[in-house]
């Protein structure tokens, strides 16, 4: 039961995280105009990965897409790439994890296959989360660098008469959405990997244990202890063989393929 819960929760957390990564990638407010010097501005600028926008006090908002690829900063391109890779990996991870869910039965899929799929999706979620966190962090670092550079050149006097106020940008909402979403996807991935350990089929546990025969010999079939007796009446003895990794009721809730002969 705990494994199902861990896997299910990991899936849900990752799903929320990936939705957040998609939202962050699409959001226009990656960087917003710093209002420290002018809190009541009549023209408010903000920028995303795909377009920059201006919101006037009149309520009129104008957005212009970045219609060039080569003219854009390499860092911005890198951030775009990281976010897209994160989304793609996350989407594939979600697809894989749906089939890996313990609560969903697809034909006669073995536990080992489900365990492998859970691990695969978990790794994908971890990498997806890391991509998002990296992308957002690279953009944030770029902002910090530009912020202090523009602060140094904040006012350039033209003959001491005309002031040219340089627009400074600070962290936008998308950065925080991205960080949180990346973190959630990462956590979801870790949960899936943890769930994978619990999903590993029983025979793998047996191989790891050295057995010492005591008087009578028992023939161990690939299906495990239950398969040798033909029914699950010997579950009380199970803890001897799997190192106490699972409780009795967990064994009953995860039937192997040999239970349906």
């Amino acid at each position: 039961m705990a494994v199902t819960a861990c896997q299910g929760l990991g899936f849900v957390v990752s799903l929320i995280g990936i939705a957040g990564i998609i939202a962050a990638t699409c959001m226009d407010q990656w960087s917003t105009q710093d209002l420290y010097n002018n809190p009541v501005t009549a023209v408010f600028n903000y920028q995303g990965l795909w377009r920059s926008c201006v919101r006037e006090s009149s309520g009129f908002t104008e957005c212009r897409g970045y219609f060039t690829l080569l003219g854009l900063p390499a860092m911005l391109q890198a951030v775009r790439a990281l976010m897209i890779v994160g989304i793609v990996l996350g989407a594939i991870g979600l697809l894989v994890s749906i089939f890996a869910l313990k609560c969903i039965r697809i034909g006669s899929m073995e536990d080992s296959a489900k365990a492998n799929m859970t691990l695969t999706s978990g790794i994908m979620f971890i990498v997806s989360g890391l991509c998002a966190i990296a992308g957002v962090s690279v953009f944030a670092n770029m902002l910090v660098t530009n912020f202090w550079m523009s602060t140094a050149n904040m006012y350039t006097g033209m003959g001491g008469m005309v002031q040219t106020v340089q627009t400074r940008y600070t962290f936008g909402a998308a950065l925080f959405v991205g960080w949180v979403a990346g973190g959630l996807t990462l956590i979801g991935g870790v949960m899936m990997c943890i769930a994978c350990r619990g999903l590993a089929p029983e025979e793998t546990n047996y191989k790891a244990v050295s057995y010492h025969a005591s008087g009578h010999s028992v023939a161990y079939k690939p299906g495990g202890f239950k398969a040798s007796t033909g029914f699950g009446s010997n579950t009380k003895n199970k803890k001897i063989y799997d190192g106490g990794a699972r409780t009795e009721d967990e064994v009953q809730s995860y039937p192997s393929k040999h239970d349906y002969v």
């Epitope: 009541v40 023209v43 600028n45 903000y46 006090s57 009149s58 627009t167």
Partner: antibody, heavy 118, light 113 residues
Framework: QIQLVQSGPELKKPGETVKISCKAS????????MNWVRQAPGKGLKWMGW????????TYAEDFKGRFVFSLETSAATAYLQITNLKSEDTSTYFC???????????WGQGTSVIVSS | DIVMTQSPSSLTVTTGEKVTMSCKSS????????????LTWYQQKPGQSPKLLIY???TRESGVPYRFTGSGSGTDFTLTISSVQTDDLAIYYC?????????FGSGTKLEIK
Amino acid sequence: QIQLVQSGPELKKPGETVKISCKASGYTLTNYGMNWVRQAPGKGLKWMGWIRPNTGEPTYAEDFKGRFVFSLETSAATAYLQITNLKSEDTSTYFCARLYRGNTLDNWGQGTSVIVSS
Amino acid sequence: DIVMTQSPSSLTVTTGEKVTMSCKSSQNLLNSGNQRNYLTWYQQKPGQSPKLLIYWASTRESGVPYRFTGSGSGTDFTLTISSVQTDDLAIYYCQNGYSFPFTFGSGTKLEIK
């Protein structure tokens, strides 16, 4: 078409209060900011401030903080300018104007003349 | 506050003549985000309310005759009337729409001979 109709001229004594109305028609008042502009006799235009359409929050220019109050009555599609403790230097024509694209004042009321005299 | 300086304070011209008036701002009115200059021109005829002529320094408001042209960028702006008509007798004001408080120039009075 869009129209801003202001209340009639006012003759007041110093220390009194005046409330000028500006009724909007042809558009939704709550979609656009309302600005107030003062023009003293024979002088230029002076921006007094504006009131945000969605929140109804007023912003006042430095010279108009204190005795001047902007308000909105959305149900009546009317904006108001109230001046308390009138002084002779408040004698002016007061205009309401809609804030539009480009932060421009695209539609103006006909103006309300306020004369403060003892 | 941004200070708007208009020159000349008054102009006397004959009909059909080309006229230009200047407006200078103490701060840059060019917004880097959309590369637009937040400068507006208004026309106020005697006894009337001001009327919007040009916004974003060079965009003509609908219904405004083609003889009115706005130009300039940053801090220096110009309003040009290519062929003055008697109907153009008015005071012309420029306005900063870039930052609060919005400020107007002192105006240029156009008189017809």
